[in-house]
């Protein structure tokens, strides 16, 4: 999916009030000095691709995020702010329906999680202007 | 607990460089920008630039721009700001903050740098 | 640059009063607008964030609103530690230019 078209603003307001709430109750009893963050983007869609890819597709050691509040939350948020976003997830959706697990937190989720906030947090930095 | 330590006060001559450090604890300091800003006495918050410590990559503002330089040491976790040419118009508080974890804020300050610059 | 036009730029009021600080930007930074208090001789202490999202900590008396040009604090009942200097920012694009600031004085 190309997230050229989101609305931006509307997204970064929904992230503000309630998601970055959610990723700080998931991530709440870890030091803020565990993870580095070494995942990056360059600008606001790609930053939305990593965020996607991040929250919705399993990685090695962590398999369960997209059933969590902060997950669900960014799903809704991309489907009313990104123009034909829902319709492209409709299979992967269905794919993940079929492979779901029980929900375990374990280390290598709360890194990912970390490297999301640090994600969302670039995507919600002031545009640099050229100088 | 997140932490800014500032270097102490200065008084320099008209024409030198001042370079302030701010020194970082607390959290993953390459994770989060920092933003310089000063204030005259009396006066209100002007916001010279910010750095990527990760990157170094900076940003200033138009003011600044050729006077100022900030820097950031990953193995110390302390960011600086240097001043050159300094006048008398720069007196004033310096003060370094922390962008916040959602990007949207800067949430922890330095507890400030006093410069005077006088003859 | 944009700039940020605070009003008014002091105020007297009571303990117990409701208070109310505008801030106008030059043009539409959405919902990119941060309040800072700062008191005489410390730094500034961010408010809120967002233009309406409360920092952790800050009591529930101060509350922000507004987007696009136009934005307020407000702090529903004046308490005696609220008597400070107020500053909103806008967090758009670079530079982030602040507001001239309101002194809140006892009245």
């Known amino acids: 999916y190309d997230f050229t078209n989101c609305d931006f603003e509307k997204i970064k307001a929904a992230y503000l009030s309630t998601i970055s709430k959610d990723l700080i109750t998931y991530m709440s009893g870890t030091k803020s000095t565990e993870f580095n963050n070494t995942v990056s983007c360059s600008n606001r869609p790609h930053c939305l691709t990593e965020i996607q890819s991040l929250t919705f597709n399993p990685t090695a050691g962590c398999a369960s995020l997209a059933k969590e509040m902060f997950a669900m939350k960014t799903k809704a948020a991309l489907a009313i702010w990104c123009p034909g976003y829902s319709e492209t997830q409709i299979n992967a959706t269905q794919a993940m329906k079929k492979r779901r697990k029980r929900k375990v937190t374990t280390n290598k989720c709360l890194e990912q999680v970390s490297q999301l906030q640090g994600l969302w947090r670039r995507f919600n930095r002031p545009l640099l202007k050229q100088q | 607990q997140v932490q800014l330590v500032q270097s102490g006060a200065e008084v320099k001559k008209p024409g030198a460089s001042v370079k302030v450090s701010c020194k970082a604890s607390g959290y993953a300091f390459t994770n989060y920008l920092i933003e310089w800003v000063r204030q005259a006495p009396g006066q209100g918050l002007e916001w010279m630039g910010i750095?990527?410590?990760?990157?170094?990559?900076?940003y200033y503002a138009q003011k600044f721009q050729g006077r100022v330089t900030m820097t950031a040491d990953k193995s110390t976790s302390t960011a600086y700001m240097e001043l050159s040419s300094l006048r008398s118009e720069d007196s004033a508080v310096y003060f370094c903050?922390?962008?916040?974890?959602?990007?949207?804020?800067?949430?922890?300050w330095g507890q400030g740098t006093t410069l005077t610059v006088s003859s | 640059d944009i700039q940020m036009t605070q009003s008014p730029s002091s105020l007297s009021a009571s303990v117990g009063d409701r208070v109310t600080i505008t801030c106008r930007a030059s043009?539409?930074?959405?919902?990119?607008l941060v309040w800072y208090q700062q008191k005489p001789g410390k730094a500034p202490q961010l408010l809120v964030y967002g233009a309406r999202n409360l920092a952790d900590g800050v009591p529930s008396r101060f509350s922000g609103s507004g987007s696009g040009t136009q934005f307020s604090l407000t702090i529903s009942s004046l308490q005696p530690e609220d008597f400070a200097t107020y500053y909103c920012q806008h967090f758009y694009e670079t530079p982030l230019t602040f507001g001239t600031g309101t002194k809140l004085e006892i009245k």
């Open positions: 750095i990527n410590p990760e990157s170094g990559d900076t």
């Open positions: 043009e539409n930074i959405y919902s990119n």
């Open positions: 903050a922390k962008e916040s974890l959602t990007g949207s804020s800067y949430d922890y």
